[in-house]
């Protein structure tokens, strides 16, 4: 997260750290007791590694009573996700067991109504992704409030040049932005999960390259079918 600040500890109980061989890889969001939603690209290079999900965390390194690391029983990338595109960049991770719920671990309601979030709406994005251009890794969860950007502006030739389909949304990125390591994390508007950070370009904090988020409402049928 660029230009953000440390989040209030455990105030986002849905927040997950998807880890590869014990290191934070991507964000994720608890959407059901045994399921975490993240980004498909996160597992592209994880073939030989051990993927786990950390729940109930604020600090990645410090002991916290609510923290627990779960093994992954099953990883389900969206069937249409591909390495070279940002489309359909969703992944569902089934935990080895149901998460122990409590004040610091709680699923987040996700948007099912397939309607665009109004441009200008302030949405919260959180993660343990890098916070500067030298790869500074935060130990504690960071967050930032970002205004939703209309699709027409986001699709300008100077911006994302038509790449933003109806199944994607954008948020402003002028010095405040999601960044590498935040992929898979939640974009929350009005207390509801609206988007998932895509594993796209490494350009962060550049106003001409708005952050791209996968609209979960557009994938409601797929999410429901996997969770069923």
């Amino acid at each position: 997260i660029l230009g953000g600040r440390e989040a209030e500890a455990h105030a986002r109980p849905y927040m997950a750290s998807v880890q590869l061989n014990g290191a934070h890889l991507c964000g994720g969001v608890l959407v059901a007791e045994q399921w975490v939603l993240s980004a498909a690209h996160c597992l592209e290079d994880a073939a030989d590694g051990k993927v786990q999900v950390l729940l109930g965390a604020h600090s990645l390194s410090q002991p916290e009573p609510s923290k627990r690391l779960y093994d992954v029983l099953r990883a389900v990338p969206h069937p249409d996700s591909q390495p070279d595109t940002i489309d359909h960049d969703l992944l569902l991770l089934q935990l080895s067991e149901k998460a122990t719920l409590g004040p610091a671990v709680r699923p987040l309601p996700w948007q099912r109504v397939d309607r665009d979030v109004a441009p200008g709406t302030l949405c919260d994005v959180a993660g343990w992704g890098i916070v500067n251009h030298a790869g500074r890794r935060p130990d504690s969860l960071q967050h930032v409030l970002l205004p939703v950007l209309d699709r027409a502006t986001c699709n300008r030739a100077t911006h994302h040049d038509g790449a933003i389909t109806e199944r994607l949304m954008c948020a402003e990125s002028n010095r405040r932005d999601s960044c590498k390591g935040d992929s898979g994390g939640p974009l929350v508007c009005g207390g509801v999960l609206e988007g998932v950070v895509t594993s796209g370009s490494r350009v962060c904090g550049n106003a001409k390259k708005p952050g791209i988020y996968t609209r979960v409402a557009s994938y409601a049928a797929w999410i429901d079918s996997v969770l069923a």
Partner: antibody
Framework: QVQLQQPGAELVRPGTSVKLSCKAS????????MHWVKQRPGQGLEWIGV????????NYNQKFKGKATLTVDTSSSTAYMQLSSLTSEDSAVYYC???????????WGQGTSVTVSS | DIQMTQTTSSLSASLGDRVTISCRAS??????LNWYQQKPDGTVKLLIY???RLHSGVPSRFSGSGSGTDYSLTISNLEQEDFATYFC?????????FGGGTKLEIK
């Protein structure tokens, strides 16, 4: 356990180049950026720059742009720093350090001592 | 660039003592302050980051504190292996910069 292995010493001629290596083990190489730091005899430490092994993105201290070039070989989990147009000012110990939390370097190599002499 | 100043370049102490090493930044570094130990053979280890979190494997006799521009490292109950040089480093603003070091010597 995390280990960063660096050769002990390099003796090089003025005006030439040298490529220093830092072989990582005990962790997933592409998951952590790698820093390089310079220490002149009896002096403090200077940050040279950092590289992300997952895509070779680099960020340099302005002072070392044109002097240092950072690269990686992910197949051997090795980070490299090439120093060019060497002068006596480049005689120093050079460390690699794994990117830790909050701008720290959590594991360091033993350092390579570079002596520039004719 | 942010200047990091360790006013005490050397410090003498005895086994079992408690010592405090200070570090001042030329501007607010928002707690992005780290401490390292360098042994005479050149070996460097991270002790503390941000600015009071103990790196894994570091004994609890080491502690850090501070905010804004002023930070300190405290070593309680000094042991033989603690006699070394200690550097502070700011990780707030590029380029990252280090203090000049404080050499802790045996009295």
């Amino acid at each position: 356990q995390v280990q960063l292995q660096q050769p002990g010493a390099e003796l090089v001629r003025p005006g030439t180049s040298v490529k220093l290596s830092c072989k990582a083990s005990g962790y997933t190489f592409t998951s952590y950026w790698m820093h390089w730091v310079k220490q002149r005899p009896g002096q403090g430490l200077e940050w040279i720059g950092v590289i992300d092994p997952s895509d070779s993105y680099t960020n340099y201290n302005q002072k070392f742009k044109g002097k240092a070039t950072l690269t990686v070989d992910t197949s051997s989990s090795t980070a490299y720093m090439q120093l060019s147009s060497l002068t006596s000012e480049d005689s120093a110990v050079y460390y690699c350090g794994r990117n830790g939390y909050d701008g720290s370097m959590d594991y360091w190599g033993q350092g390579t001592s570079v002596t520039v002499s004719s | 660039d942010i200047q990091m100043t360790q006013t005490t370049s050397s410090l003498s102490a005895s086994l079992g003592d408690r010592v405090t090493i200070s570090c001042r930044a030329s501007q607010d570094i928002s707690n992005y302050l780290n401490w390292y130990q360098q042994k005479p053979d050149g070996t460097v280890k991270l002790l503390i980051y941000y600015p009071s979190r103990l790196h894994s494997g570091v004994p609890s006799r080491f502690s850090g504190s501070g905010s804004g521009t002023d930070y300190s490292l405290t070593i309680s109950n000094l042991e033989q292996e603690d006699f070394a040089t200690y550097f502070c480093q700011q990780g707030n603003t590029l380029p990252y910069t280090f203090g000049g070091g404080t050499k802790l010597e045996i009295k």
